[in-house]
């Protein structure tokens, strides 16, 4: 399977959802749950999904997980997975989503979704 490279519309939708979550955060997101941080590179949407899937009973990120599943419906094969699957540090979900938003905006600005 190739590394998922999203179209502009699907990436824009994810960005809007991440903005909505991170800007409207009133209390610790998902009760302050921790997830594995990532080197958000080539398979970042798959890697992000793999990290967030461990968080259950947190309806706020349910839509984000579904969007990531839509962007990465098939698991990348081992040959396409590199450093983004190194798991050595855990961070709060809120920070994770901010990092994902920042990287997604960079991809969108660079137009590398085509």
């Amino acid at each position: 399977s190739p590394n998922p490279v999203p179209s502009s519309s699907s990436l824009k939708e994810l960005i809007e959802e991440l903005v909505n979550i991170t800007q409207n955060q009133k209390v610790p997101l998902c009760n302050g749950s921790m997830v594995w941080s990532l080197n958000l590179t080539s398979s970042m949407y798959c890697a992000a999904l793999d990290s967030l899937i461990s968080i259950s009973n947190c309806s706020v990120i349910h839509r984000t997980k579904r969007m990531l599943s839509a962007l990465c419906p098939h698991k990348p094969s081992a040959k396409h997975v590199s450093s983004e699957y190194v798991r050595d540090t855990k961070i709060e979900v809120a920070q994770f989503l901010k990092d994902l938003l920042r990287h997604s905006r960079i991809i969108f600005r660079n137009g590398s979704y085509n």
Epitope: S1, P2, N3, P4, V5, P6, S7, S9, S10, L11, E13, L49, D50, I53, S54, R66, M67, L68, S69, A70, L71, C72, P73, H74, K75, S77, Y113
Partner: antibody, heavy 118, light 111 residues
Framework: EVQLVESGGGLVQPGGSLRLSCAAS????????MSWVRQAPGKGLEWVAS???????YYPDSVKGRFTISRDNAKNSLYLQMNSLRAEDTAVYYC????????????WGQGTLVTVSS | DIQMTQSPSSLSASVGDRVTITCKAS??????????VHWYQQKPGKAPKLLIY???NLESGVPSRFSGSGSGTDFTLTISSLQPEDFATYYC?????????FGGGTKVEIK
Amino acid sequence: EVQLVESGGGLVQPGGSLRLSCAASGFTFSSYAMSWVRQAPGKGLEWVASISSGDTTYYPDSVKGRFTISRDNAKNSLYLQMNSLRAEDTAVYYCARNEGYYFGLTLWGQGTLVTVSS
Amino acid sequence: DIQMTQSPSSLSASVGDRVTITCKASESVDHFGWSLVHWYQQKPGKAPKLLIYRASNLESGVPSRFSGSGSGTDFTLTISSLQPEDFATYYCQQSNEDPWTFGGGTKVEIK
């Protein structure tokens, strides 16, 4: 009503081409990955193709280079262009909503029959 | 490719019976602790329907008499008390590796 409706099946000669369509309704089509799965008469299920919401495509080796999956979000439609058809491609072709490797194929159409025969 | 082997290929049972179907993968289908196996029900002339995702999670709207278990290479679908509408063919499917593959199916018939 949330549903998928396939069309375009029929009888085609070996080496011929056919284009299947799948009309989605009742959900935000553009927000989901989609797949085609086939079932030969009296046999089991076989995954044929998938397309992400971002238009990344995936195929098994059995159809790679012959089949092309595509989507038109404006028309809420999924397509499967099938070229160089073989007798072993004879099957009912199902369109399915693909919610990813963690969630499976959550919604299926009723299927359309493709018969490859001379 | 990962082969998914279901057993039995068919079985006869009565309404109220407890039915167990097994699915064995040719290699582990676990990914970061999650088992990427799903179960579907198909009635004659109809499309498949998702019952269980990720080995043990009940899909929304599916009766609680259906349950799934297992990890690694061995998985089980259980129907705790068979109902008339449960007579159908059941398929397991793995999504841990492309190509996604299905088991050969288990046909549950009326005894």
